[in-house]
Interface confidence: medium
Amino acid sequence: ELCDDDPPEIPHATFKAMAYKEGTMLNCECKRGFRRIKSGSLYMLCTGNSSHSSWDNQCQCTSSATRNTTKQVTPQPEEQKERKTTEMQSPMQPVDQASLPGHCREPPPWENEATERIYHFVVGQMVYYQCVQGYRALHRGPAESVCKMTHGKTRWTQPQLICTGEMETSQFPGEEKPQASPEGRPESETSCLVTTTDFQIQTEMAATMETSIFTTEYQ
């Protein structure tokens, strides 16, 4: 079930998905001056079975100049960007798929793709928010939004994140402070260990941790 609307927009914040639920579609958009190849896919689709998920279809772009037409498929201008976009992640970094069954990783870039990716999310998708550079988080979280189905309609939960300029006051007059709701707290899944000087390898919460320390002298 596709989500009807877009994840909430938070001023001075961007969102990203860590992985994409099966059923998610990614538009095959090309950068200015390029277009989808003739009979090329309109979108990539995250599909899979219980053990493996992957993107079906391949996006391919070709130079618009190779065809005698003025029509181009290009991303919208910066000031009229479609929503449901995430910036390309570069370099592509793999997501721990084993812990996310039924999800696809970020698809690798294709040649001459648009600078913004347009996704069509499905119910259950979670996206994460962070303040853009130069802004700091007020109400430090939970800065995620989930597409949920309620009474036959889809809606995105509201992330509790406000991004404010460093020089701005930390109070917003007349603004109600959202109360955090701790019920959605996930159980601990990850152990994090820093190094020790004697290079111990410890086990904590059933997870083994590798540790290391590096020192460098300034030349």
Epitope: M18, P142, K177, C192
Partner: antibody, heavy 106, light 107 residues
């Protein structure tokens, strides 16, 4: 003094990318001090004003490892350095590393 | 930055006592307040998050309350393993800041 140290924090047993990894230090006999943090999925770090320009926090999603590098070390940087995980900067730092003792001496 | 002030800075108590530690924020932080316990040579351990929610695996003798600027950590019946240093921490805004700590010692 004057050198730099890079400490790594490797997580295993679950999803790494969407959690915030914070670095907190504790000087001998002193309290806890937040240095900065990173959410690996975004890659950009936040730093406490006090450490701005001297600390660099990075993360490598492919190895589920976060790094904290502190440069221009001085004697007052002698401390135990912890990494801690928090679910998106709200629920508190629920999983901590065991700590690395960094001693700065000439 | 938001300042967090804990009181008392040290406290002597006996096993079985009811102990209360308070934490005050320099501005309203809603319920964005966490409590940690730290024993010598060990990493801090999260006890309470969101002012009053008990972290998984933490004994129910620990409880937290408060909202806005004033918060309390209560240990209903002190156990031998509870002697440690306790810290409050606000997660309302960046940077997160900690109280100076309350050292709980045996009487």
């Amino acid at each position: 003094p004057g050198s730099s140290v890079k400490v790594s924090c490797k997580a295993s047993g679950g999803t790494f990318s969407s959690y915030a990894i914070s670095w907190v230090r504790q000087a001998p006999g002193q309290g806890l001090e937040w240095m900065g943090g990173i959410i690996p999925i975004f890659g950009t770090a936040n730093y406490a004003q006090k450490f701005q320009g001297r600390v660099t926090i990075t993360a490598d999603e492919s190895t589920s490892t976060a790094y904290m590098e502190l440069s221009s070390l001085r004697s007052e940087d002698t401390a135990v350095y912890y990494c801690a995980r928090e679910m998106y900067y709200y629920y508190g730092m629920d999983v901590w590393g065991q700590g690395t003792t960094v001693t700065v001496s000439s | 930055d938001i300042q967090m002030t804990q009181s008392p800075s040290s406290l002597s108590a006996s096993v079985g006592d009811r102990v209360t530690i308070t934490c005050r924020a320099s501005q309203s932080i809603s319920n964005y307040l966490n409590w940690y316990q730290q024993k010598p040579g060990k990493a801090p351990k999260l006890l309470i998050y969101a002012a009053s929610s008990l972290q998984s695996g933490v004994p129910s003798r620990f409880s937290g309350s408060g909202s806005g600027t004033d918060f309390t950590l209560t240990i209903s019946s002190l156990q031998p393993e509870d002697f440690a240093t306790y810290y409050c921490q606000q997660s309302y805004s960046t940077p997160p800041t900690f109280g100076q700590g309350t050292k709980l010692e045996t009487k």
